[in-house]
């Protein structure tokens, strides 16, 4: 999940004129910039969210926006300031012609503009089976801790409160913004308007087919009775969620986001800002069948993005389109014919899909992660969501080829016990955007701000890659790939873990001169090796084949290709322990796995040798995969020879800590 | 079609700064790598930088810390920023795009630019 | 980084006749090479790239062979248009890219 992700138009207005005299004119050179949504239907212009620079104070985003309506009045236009912001970002929302744009990204403070556009509720008109743990039955369904310490807001159409599913487990709030809904001989209906919140309230906590039984939730009306809404709307939502824990500050939040719109980089950061003050989101992939990373806020990659699967554990088609999936995608949970609480009566049960459904079941089981441990970081929260879930089971052939190996094999489940996964090194895998196809593209992954990178691959569909490094950026280090000359482009693939009071460094080797191969290893005391990577400037490695095998008694090294840079992930934290396990293969062939044993959490993922016919290497779960150009254009020579190289760790600091809890 | 259009060459004394301009039509530069490549006399042909389509920019050891490269998606054109100008920087410059899968492709016109005193 | 010499320095040769131009390496580029020409008060122009694989517009007399570090741009048959200079570049190792020192083909 990245912001720098797709056919999102981001229309730049270089503006250096010193118009008006402005007393604070931007510095000469600085550009704000324009961005509307690429789906053309969906956007609303006339309507602007001015987001001002990370610093403003209120009073000067109120500042700007007078200056705004004095300099649109002196040329004869009428402007109106339907919002302040703050609290989440600062700027404004101002209703005016888009004759003003270029006026108004000369403002001082001013970051960018977004044209306001809408979005939409993410549903169509055997769940517990899936999430259950298997030594429970759905049907005496008693989870260990109803998420009563956990306060869950619904961002949703309006919801009937008085449903026995959810009565006396909603709180319905005064917040209201909706647009007007289309058509002219549109009939508002109470049950019609209040049909996908109510649904949804029960999944996430209704009194007989709710996740979380326990779980209390607050409601905002963010869409209108068609499931129509907008990302100005939403994002005064997410201010007033904002403002409230400021003013009343609970236990843990759950933000549930049931609706998509397209890529909007305000509405992302504004999810991003709300997460940063440990608050956990959850919203819907969409149900376009389409990538995640173009919808909003499911790109967001602060925020838990959930697919829809099926009682079978496939993909949920819906009409012509289906559940959204790629890299933006955190997992997959129960999102096709879901029974949950009706409108029609406060009796009425109705079965609903898409994946509103989903991120509620998965809003639903956070609440009940952070109801058993308060103190979860949502970093926490998202490695044990992905920990807990069920792998492998999604029949991968539905969604399109390129995004196979991008989109999470993951369904959600609920923690066998809510307690006691203390002792676990957690690791996830993060996938960049893809790079594009010049010679000097390359592509970055990031971890969470509390998550350690602890390796980082890469791979490339046409093999034309120049490897990868870890390197700092603004403090952290992030996975950077990069593309080859003629390649298609190429994807780094962060290596994302958990580790408490870590200090890892990054320990290179240049290219060596000499035939043996370039080595590095893990000097300093204390340090493992959590993982290798390389990086070569030439755009073809020679068939040079480093001595795979390490010599004994030195696991803490990295093996490369003589023209190839090398770099070692060094870390020391308190109880870590790794270990390298190889599985090679000698005849060519097209993937080369090699997995951890229980216990131990792969940490680092490469191959040996580096040379071209290798596309890459990725990790899935706690298997390593190595993946090899199609055999037939290798041919059985020695060349095709292939080894999968896996750091396994565990931490047993973790482990006695756990024990002393228990 | 592809053009590149260049403009901002001169004389400058040593030590002066000049900027170089390249527009580009035809096709849209923040989706290419753009190079600078310049051409003297005494040395032949000689890559000055560039600018990848994902941003990161490369010197060669000559110029490094004294020209700085760069884009402006806007007004679909790549710069060239010249400080502490020396008399060996004398050349005519071109600005160059490099296809996905060819090498330098298109070329601009070519702009002289002469330091002297 | 990488050297690259060509020779002749200067090649005269009648109009019609075949010319062969050279183009060494100081390590291998493996087949990341390309040829250009140019004439006089114009851009350089691309000929040859992947050592053998001609530009779009580039007529059939043109010609490249080699890899590794030795390698040839053949003119089967020159046309007065092809007088000019003619240029390698490496583009395997960067940065930097690196250019030959250039052959004059000349009118003999």
């Known amino acids: 999940q990245e912001d720098e992700d797709g056919d999102y138009e981001e229309l730049v207005l270089a503006l250096r004129s010193e118009e008006d005299g402005l007393a604070e004119a931007p510095e000469h050179g600085t550009t704000a910039t324009f961005h509307r949504c690429a789906k053309d239907p969906w956007r609303l212009p006339g309507t602007y969210v001015v987001v001002l620079k990370e610093e403003t104070h209120l009073s000067q985003s109120e500042r700007t926006a007078r200056r705004l309506q004095a300099q649109a009045a002196r040329r004869g236009y009428l402007t109106k300031i339907l919002h302040v912001f703050h609290g989440l970002l600062p700027g404004f929302l101002v209703k005016m012609s888009g004759d003003l744009l270029e006026l108004a990204l000369k403002l001082p403070h001013v970051d960018y503009i977004e044209e306001d556009s809408s979005v939409f509720a993410q549903s169509i008109p055997w769940n517990l089976e899936r999430i259950t743990p298997p030594r429970y039955r759905a049907d005496e369904y008693q989870p260990p801790d109803g998420g009563s310490l956990v306060e869950v807001y619904l961002l949703d159409t309006s919801i009937q409160s008085d449903h026995r599913e959810i009565e006396g487990r909603v709180m319905v709030t005064d917040f209201e913004n909706v647009p007007e809904e289309d058509g002219t001989r549109f009939h508002r209906q109470a049950s019609k308007c209040d049909s996908h919140g109510t649904h949804l309230a029960g999944v996430v906590s209704g009194r007989d087919a709710g996740v979380a039984k326990g779980a209390s939730m607050r409601s905002l009306r963010v869409l209108n009775c068609q499931g129509k809404g907008t990302v100005s709307g939403t994002l005064i939502g997410l201010e007033f969620i904002r403002k409230s824990q400021l003013v009343q500050p609970v236990g843990p939040l759950v933000v549930l986001l049931p609706l998509a719109g397209g890529y909007s980089r305000v509405l992302n950061a504004a999810c991003q800002r709300l997460a940063r003050a440990g608050v956990v989101l959850v919203t819907a992939a969409g149900n376009f069948r389409d990538d995640a990373c173009l919808y909003s806020p499911a790109s967001a990659p602060e925020v838990i993005t959930v697919g829809a699967t099926n009682a079978q554990d496939q993909p949920v088609t819906l009409g012509t389109l289906g559940t959204n999936f790629g890299r933006c995608v955190d997992l997959f949970a129960p999102g096709e014919d879901i029974i949950g609480a009706s409108s029609d009566c406060s009796t009425c049960f109705v079965s609903q899909s898409g994946t509103s459904q989903a991120a509620a079941h998965v809003a639903g089981i956070a609440a009940m992660m952070l109801s058993a441990e308060p103190e979860l970081t949502l970093a926490e929260l998202r490695q044990r969501l992905i920990h807990f879930s069920a792998k492998d089971v999604i029949n991968e052939a539905w969604f399109p080829e390129d995004q196979r190996v991008l989109t999470p094999n993951l369904v959600a489940a609920l923690p066998p016990s809510t307690h006691g996964a203390g002792w676990q090194l957690f690791c996830r895998t993060v996938w960049s955007a893809h790079s594009g196809p010049t010679r000097m593209a390359t592509a970055v992954a990031r971890c969470a701000p509390d998550e350690e990178l602890l390796s980082c691959s890469s791979f490339s569909r046409s093999g034309k890659r120049r490897g990868e490094r870890m390197e700092a950026q603004g403090g952290k280090l992030v996975c950077r790939a990069h593309n080859a000359f003629g390649g298609e482009g190429v994807y780094a693939i962060a290596r994302c873990c958990l580790l408490p009071q870590a200090n890892c460094s990054v320990h290179t080797a240049p290219p060596a001169e000499a035939s043996m191969g370039t080595r590095v290893h893990c000097h300093q005391q204390g340090h493992v090796l959590t993982g290798c990577s390389s990086h070569w400037e030439v755009e073809d490695l020679g068939t040079h084949k480093p001595p795979v095998l390490r010599p004994r008694g030195q696991p803490n090294q990295c093996v490369g290709h003589r023209e190839a840079s090398i770099h070692a992930s060094c870390c020391h934290a308190p109880g870590l322990e790794c270990k390298v396990k190889e599985h090679g293969i000698p005849a060519p062939q097209e993937q080369v796995t090699v997995a951890c044993e229980e216990g131990w959490t792969l940490t680092g993922c490469s191959a040996l040798p580096g040379t071209s016919h290798v596309l890459g290497a990725y990790a899935v779960d706690n298997t390593c995969v190595v993946r090899s150009r199609d055999v037939s254009t290798t041919g059985s020579t020695s060349e095709g020879a292939v080894t999968a190289v896996a750091i396994c760790c565990r931490s047993r600091h973790l482990a006695q800590a756990s024990q002393e809890l228990q | 079609q592809v053009q590149l259009v260049q403009s901002g060459g001169g004389l400058v004394q040593p030590g002066g700064s000049l900027r170089l301009s390249c527009a580009a039509s035809?096709?849209?530069?923040?989706?290419?790598?753009m190079h600078w490549v310049r051409q003297s006399t005494g040395k032949g042909l000689e890559w000055v930088s560039a600018i990848g389509s994902t941003g990161d920019t490369y010197y060669p050891g000559s110029v490094k810390g004294r020209f700085t490269i760069t884009r402006e998606k806007a007004k679909n054109s790549v710069y060239l920023q010249m400080n502490s100008l020396r008399a060996g920087d004398t050349a005519v410059y071109y600005c160059?795009?490099?296809?996905?899968?060819?090498?330098?492709?298109?070329w601009g016109q070519g702009t002289l630019v002469t330091v002297s005193s | 980084d990488i050297q690259m010499t060509q020779s002749p320095a200067t090649l005269s040769v009648s109009p019609g006749e075949r010319a062969a131009l050279s183009c060494r390496a100081s390590?291998?580029?493996?087949?990341?090479l390309a040829w250009y020409h140019q004439k006089p008060g114009q851009a350089p122009r691309l000929l040859i790239y992947g050592a053998s694989t001609r530009a779009t517009g580039i007529p059939a007399r043109f010609s490249g062979i080699g890899s590794g570090t030795e390698f040839t741009l053949i003119i089967s048959s020159l046309q007065s248009e092809d007088f000019a200079f003619y240029f390698c570049q490496q583009y395997n190792n960067w940065p930097p890219f690196t250019f030959g020192p250039g052959t004059k083909v000349e009118i003999k």
């Open positions: 160059v795009r490099e296809g996905w899968e060819v090498p330098f492709d298109y």
């Open positions: 035809g096709f849209t530069l923040s989706s290419y790598d």
């Open positions: 390590q291998s580029v493996s087949s990341n």
